[in-house]
Amino acid sequence: TQHGIRLPLRSGLGGAPLGLRLPRETDEEPEEPGRRGSFVEMVDNLRGKSGQGYYVEMTVGSPPQTLNILVDTGSSNFAVGAAPHPFLHRYYQRQLSSTYRDLRKGVYVPYTQGKWEGELGTDLVSIPHGPNVTVRANIAAITESDKFFINGSNWEGILGLAYAEIARPDDSLEPFFDSLVKQTHVPNLFSLQLCGAGFPLNQSEVLASVGGSMIIGGIDHSLYTGSLWYTPIRREWYYEVIIVRVEINGQDLKMDCKEYNYDKSIVDSGTTNLRLPKKVFEAAVKSIKAASSTEKFPDGFWLGEQLVCWQAGTTPWNIFPVISLYLMGEVTNQSFRITILPQQYLRPVEDVATSQDDCYKFAISQSSTGTVMGAVIMEGFYVVFDRARKRIGFAVSACHVHDEFRTAAVEGPFVTLDMEDCGYNIPQTDESTLMTGRA
């Protein structure tokens, strides 16, 4: 884990109050029974914020033990705190569960910084504000960790929603969502609406506020506006996609598109930032600096370290450019673009200067493991993880932060040739070396 970046996360609704849903435009996708419509019981079932993660309430064991679990599309283990820890208010007590089964196997997950380790078992799991089902799922009971749990984050475990290929200790450990789909009639699809506040929230405000929605088994019309546009899942490990073009305020970065996906591009709710490969990051920052050149900011700001503050309510959003990522479309030679605002990539930070200030960190950072479309991207959009059809959908989120002049957008189609060439083929290596630096 890189502090401030990757799980556990250490990192904009200004337009409408929570709960106010904007009217939907027409949806050209055909209705699919059981997949679309209203999922009232699941709407607003997430809490949290981009800097510390979004979590859902889950119950584990018999009788049920309630825990808050971080939703992470960038990993594939269901892992929960199972021993006392200074940052945990509660933890999974296996000895109190009559349905717990020990798998007599350990699991160790190191990150770039920090780690967790534990013991594998299975137990009955349900999601109170989710589908009305109970499944027997693999659980990693975390007995030791370092720089994993976050003080004040209010979550006690992690729900890895990616594919078995990246599960630990190996791909034979079935991920939770696979178990859910196998054991129930829940369609093989989930969707996420992460709602950034656009302003810093203190602990009590996070507990009281809505953080968004995880719709399990379907798509909720009320959570987005306009149309959903889909990009293929390139390979079922992470949720890997292909970026074919990048623009800053409409200006093409003009890089070989392979650079955008070197060595992969993934959609990851468990990462705070938009993370870009070194060359792409440098080009993007140069372009963002040029676009906002009427004001200069300290070098440390562009590194995501120093905070920049403005008097409350005077943040000059207009000087910062919009960023567009073009994604491979479902049709040959067709792409679409998703556009985020500075309200997404400048992350509000609490408890620093004075109450008369609004302070932000730059939430785009450098990566050595490819592009990571983290919470700052996802907070602009309703994102559909359509596993059944091996695709990811994007639509403008009904809760994204914007101003009166600009809004996040999902637009298409655009003609883009030779998009397959944009994908990078990772040389086959021992998976253990591939996985230890989950930046």
Epitope: S293, K296, D299, G300, E305, Q306, L307, V308, C309, V352
Partner: antibody
């Protein structure tokens, strides 16, 4: 080498406006590498940041002084200025102009300072 | 608001002795901290930036250390010209606005 020199009246009456100018010599105020700032120090006390300006005219002010402060720049004269309105005795201080370098983060070069007394 | 607390308020030492000055931030400022020296009737002078980097022309007897919330300025062997007031300043929050209250190093 680059030098900064503050100038302006040493005595200002209460409720009036304090006006100071900082002249940059030995270098250009239009350098894209620096912000320029004002800091003050009441007699026998610590340092208080007032505000910064970039040659483009972009300004940042101390929230506690913002309603009374204006900082401006005149690139043709290689100068930047401070105006502090509605002064009281509490504004009596040595006023320093300084350059904000090292990635716009640190006050790495200071003027000698000028004492401004607010008194009737 | 980030508050910088310097200690001790006054340090009485003799030339040749080692001086250790402390600056504590009310919350983490990473390594974005500076140290200034101010002699009577003069403007402050930048000694250390980014917690541990000596500014141009600053003698090697001055060194800075620390990160997060606890920082130290060390003068390995006091010279007569080192007796002055020393201030720390955080620039983690930008624009840089917060100075510590100062430590006076006086001749014993």
């Amino acid at each position: 080498q680059l030098q900064l020199q503050e100038s302006g009246p040493g005595l200002v009456k209460p409720s009036e406006t304090l006006s100071l100018t900082c002249t940059v010599s030995g270098g250009s105020i239009s350098s894209s590498s620096y912000y320029w700032g004002w800091i003050r120090q009441p007699p026998g006390k610590g340092l208080e940041w007032i505000g910064n300006i970039y040659y483009s005219g972009s300004t940042y002010y101390n929230p506690s002084l913002k309603s009374r402060v204006t900082i401006s720049v005149d690139t043709s004269k290689n100068q930047f200025s401070l105006k502090l309105s509605s002064v009281t005795a509490a504004d009596t201080a040595v006023y320093y102009c300084a350059r904000l370098g090292h990635g716009y983060s640190y006050f790495d070069l200071w003027g000698r300072g000028t004492l401004v007394t607010v008194s009737s | 608001e980030i508050v910088l607390t310097q200690s001790p308020a006054t340090l009485s030492l003799s030339p040749g002795e080692r001086a250790t000055l402390s600056c504590r931030a009310s919350q983490s400022v990473s390594s974005y901290l500076a140290w200034f020296q101010q002699k009577p009737g003069q403007a402050p002078r930048l000694l250390i930036y980014d917690a541990s980097n000596r500014a141009t022309g600053i003698p090697a007897r001055f060194s800075g250390s620390g990160s997060g919330t606890d920082f130290t300025l060390t003068i390995s062997s006091l010279e007569p010209e080192d007796f002055a007031v020393y201030y720390c300043q955080q620039v983690y929050v930008w624009p840089p606005r917060t100075f510590g209250g100062g430590t006076k190093v006086e001749i014993k």
